[in-house]
């Protein structure tokens, strides 16, 4: 069929709750492309009717909610004028009752479901909620061993649970819950998180290291396309998030209307005790307003920026 397979993504999901996956792969999806979702090599695309339980919402596939029989491989086909790429997503649905005494027995949970707090430090857990704009998420509630978390040491801040002065008793099974509203209907999202405690930060600790960029400027012509990688080294037990910001706002939010500047999909390479992360920023078309503005790569407490500047005029041309 002439489509190039990009990669296979595995997702392990809980039945009876919403799930969404965004088909995005900059720079491919940054240009003029059409995105179509299919299930299990079917020739019939996933429905785009918003009343359907499973439907395509822009570049997303949305399950409202996920059901046992939805397990399988889904394909997202990205067609450009002269190109065709395909991403495979292998979804495994399991029945999980989060108030069981153990989260054990789940195959290869992703890092989103396994998080680490550092003993004696102020730390945080993150509730990973990835949904299209058509889904409105209510405030997040946090639970530990099925009891809602309360107390001075715990603060809910957007999608994070801040935990001050982490103690050994903070290990265990957590869940974050939010109400998702879509087309007037409400659904409960409940993510279980297995939390372990480490003393490692009490040794040398580890702050994410941004290898590139290095707080420098990049000469770039007006109107061109530019992709800049942010390369970060971090220990595997850290739960830092990496992102690009401008004017202290996520670039995807700041350029939400035009989508002219977008953050790419993060990739990582495993190296012994560390992960090497790459997340890029794509300027589809550099505009005058981009020059002189610091575009910041954030990784936990670490930051580094690039500043775009116009190339020096070449007087030899005159």
């Amino acid at each position: 069929d002439g489509c190039k397979d990009i990669f296979m993504k595995n997702e392990i999901l809980s039945a009876s709750q919403p799930f969404a996956f965004n088909c995005t792969f900059p720079p491919i999806t940054s240009g003029e492309v059409s995105v179509t979702w299919y299930k299990n090599s079917s020739k019939i695309p996933v429905s785009k009717i918003i009343q359907s339980r499973i439907h395509q919402d822009e570049t997303w596939i949305l399950f409202l909610p996920m059901e046992w029989g939805d397990s399988g491989v889904y394909q997202c086909v990205i067609k450009g004028r002269d190109s065709c790429h395909r991403i495979h997503v292998n979804l495994t649905v399991f029945e999980k009752h989060w108030c069981d005494t153990s989260i054990g027995g789940l195959p290869n949970l992703s890092d989103e479901y396994k998080q680490i707090l550092h003993l004696g430090k102020d730390d945080s857990l993150t509730c990973h909620l990835h949904f299209p704009k058509s889904c409105v998420l209510g405030p997040i509630k946090w639970y530990k061993d099925c009891n809602e978390i309360k107390g001075e040491r715990f603060t809910v801040l957007e999608t994070r649970l801040l935990v001050s002065n982490v103690s050994a008793e903070d290990r265990g099974n957590y869940a974050c819950q939010a109400i998702l509203t879509h087309s007037g209907k409400q659904y409960e999202v409940l993510n279980g998180i297995t939390v372990s405690i480490t003393e490692r930060a009490g040794y040398g600790g580890s702050v994410p290291k941004i290898i590139y960029p290095k707080n420098h400027s990049i000469e770039v012509q007006l109107g061109t396309t530019l992709i800049v990688d942010c390369n970060v080294t971090d220990t595997k037990d850290n739960t830092n998030l990496r992102c690009w910001r401008v004017n202290n706002t996520l670039v995807d939010d700041y350029y939400d209307e035009s989508k002219r500047i977008r953050e790419g999909v993060e990739t990582h390479v495993s190296f012994r005790e560390h992960n090497l992360y790459t997340v890029n920023i794509t300027f589809l078309e550099v505009k005058m307003e981009d020059y002189g503005l610091p575009f910041m790569c954030h990784a936990g407490v670490s930051t580094a920026y690039i500043i775009l500047q116009l190339p020096a005029p070449d007087f030899r041309a005159y």
Partner: antibody, heavy 121, light 108 residues
Framework: QVQLQESGPGLVKPSQTLSLTCTVS??????????WSWIRQHPGKGLEWIGS???????YYNPSLKSRLTISIDTSENQFSLKLTSLTAADTAVYYC?????????????WGQGTLVTVSS | DIQMTQSPSSLSASVGDRVTITCRAS??????LNWYQQKPGKAPKLLIY???SLQSGVPSRFSGSGSGTDFTLTISSLQPEDFASYYC??????????FGQGTRLEIK
């Protein structure tokens, strides 16, 4: 950058065990940003990575030496050590300890001055 | 294991010359490659890491390039103190670390 100093015998008999220690100064061996490594260089030859240890005790060994090799770490003394058993003349080399910074992959950014170990009866 | 092959194994050059040493990996190592300089009786010294990043304190006449399997160390204008042996080394994820066999740079 940290300073490293190897110590141990210069002459070892065949079939015996080589024990070397590397003392780290000017920085903590418990840094999460570093692995601590041993590298050797046979006379007139190139460099051979022996193995590395992380402050948690996780070890990474050259497969060709793994069966004879133990690397350990003592964070209280800011030292790490190498034990290589069943020595032969082919183990005669200058042995270096080095700090291996976890950066983009890793690289050896500080080295000891090296200690010549001769395996001979 | 990943084999690292350097060429040439030795070369003669004069002060002021531009010198290029190449290193080839037996499989792709992205940009996980470092370069070292070693003088007789001394420990190696890191020059370049991540294929092209200059280590702090290393003169800017040293530069590195390449990605995948083919890499280059360039000395733009040889100085008397640059006559030494040079080694490449990979640090790619799950593979044991290996060095190239070395390149000996001599005065012509």
């Amino acid at each position: 950058q940290v300073q490293l100093q190897e110590s141990g015998p210069g002459l070892v008999k065949p079939s015996q065990t080589l024990s070397l220690t590397c003392t780290v100064s000017g920085g903590s061996i418990s840094s999460a940003d570093y692995y601590w490594s041993w590298i050797r260089q046979h006379p007139g030859k190139g460099l051979e990575w022996i193995g590395s240890i992380y402050y948690t005790g996780s070890t990474y060994y050259n497969p060709s030496l793994k069966s004879r090799l133990t690397i350990s770490i003592d964070t209280s003394e800011n030292q790490f050590s190498l034990k290589l058993t069943s020595l032969t003349a082919a183990d005669t080399a200058v042995y270096y300890c080095a700090s291996e910074e976890a950066n983009w992959g890793s690289h050896f950014d500080s080295w000891g001055q090296g200690t010549l170990v001769t395996v001979s009866s | 294991d990943i084999q690292m092959t350097q060429s040439p194994s030795s070369l003669s050059a004069s002060v002021g010359d531009r010198v290029t040493i190449t290193c080839r990996a037996s499989q792709s190592i992205d940009n996980f490659l470092n370069w070292y300089q070693q003088k007789p009786g001394k420990a190696p010294k890191l020059l370049i890491y991540a294929a092209s990043s200059l280590q702090s304190g290393v003169p800017s006449r040293f530069s590195g390039s390449g990605s995948g399997t083919d890499f280059t160390l360039t000395i733009s204008s040889l100085q008397p103190e640059d006559f030494a042996s040079y080694y490449c080394q990979h640090s790619h994820s799950a593979h044991p670390i290996t060095f190239g066999q070395g390149t000996r740079l001599e005065i012509k």
